[in-house]
Amino acid sequence: PRSIDVKYIGVKSAYVSYDVQKRTIYLNITNTLNITNNNYYSVEVENITAQVQFAKTVIGKARLNNITHIGPLDMKQIDYTVPTVIAEEMSYMYDFCTLISIKVHNIVLMMQVTVTTTYFGHSEQISQERYQYVDCGRNTTYQLGQSEYLNVLQPQQ
């Protein structure tokens, strides 16, 4: 069998809401994957499990089952959404995300995804990890690849 390639493309959109009383941030993050089947037979994408971390703390998980099948030498683009919650010991981020005086409300999140494919009763798992920027201050739609992680530092003005 030839390889099945999984490529994490990036964040497609992030929709944010807040609970003012609980100082809690809710982020629905939609990600995009490209899955390429390099075989001369069809494969099933059985499930996708995803996890999102902020500062090494898991803030969201998702699992999609029985997603699709990919034909021979074909590629499919799959979107999946991970609901995340930044709360409790991380609730200091509420102020970072909502203070008007802060001009940039991006946070760096680690996106982890595992794709399980099956063919002829054989199962294969492929995992990817990427750091991505997500804006926690407003609803944002990204051009693919736009949220890739870089690093610069400045104080709140």
Epitope: F96, V104, I107, P155
Partner: antibody, heavy 125, light 107 residues
Amino acid sequence: EVQLQQSGPELVKPGASVKIPCKASGYTFTDYTMDWVKQSPGKSLEWIGHINPNDGGTFYNQKFKGKATLTVDKSSSTAYMELRSLTSEDSAVYYCARWVYYYGISYEGGAMDYWGQGTSVTVSS
Amino acid sequence: DVQITQSPSYLAASPGETITINCRASKSISKYLAWYQEKPGKTNKLLIYSGSTLQSGIPSRFSGSGSGTDFTLTISSLEPEDFAMYYCQQHNEYPWTFGGGTKLEIK
């Protein structure tokens, strides 16, 4: 010049309450959150909690819930901390401190970049 | 809560020397640690934030390093005004917690 001006020493009786002001100047009061810190005699620093002057939203160290109440008066750019049901354990110096967030392309952390001079509270009958 | 163990609690040194103060967190706090200086009659001063970034206006003889659980404040070529109390503080998660402090005295 950023300044956080706190009131002078307080001598209070056990069971009483005290309200400590922290008047901010030299910056826009609502642009930064305010933290409060306790320093008991001969001891280290303990974080009490923090308040966002925009909406009055607070987060407390569990240890100080029910003991401390944080409020702000935006019109006078003043943060307050009220301590109630005072005991000898509450005798300490209390500091207010401005919390600054650091960021570039994204969140990079924070710190207390300006501190008040501290208010000494002595609980004694 | 994240416990911060600061060492040593007391340090005697001479002007011109280089000293290090350590802080260890009970769990990973990424790079989210700040260092402060406390001197009698003065307001507390922020020295370092995000583990290693020097606060504006602080002399370059102060430096910070570390991430995860182990952090170090280094003061090279000690000046007379550096003899003071030093504290580290984590801000990776609520409640913020401080180290026990290090008293730096002139030998």
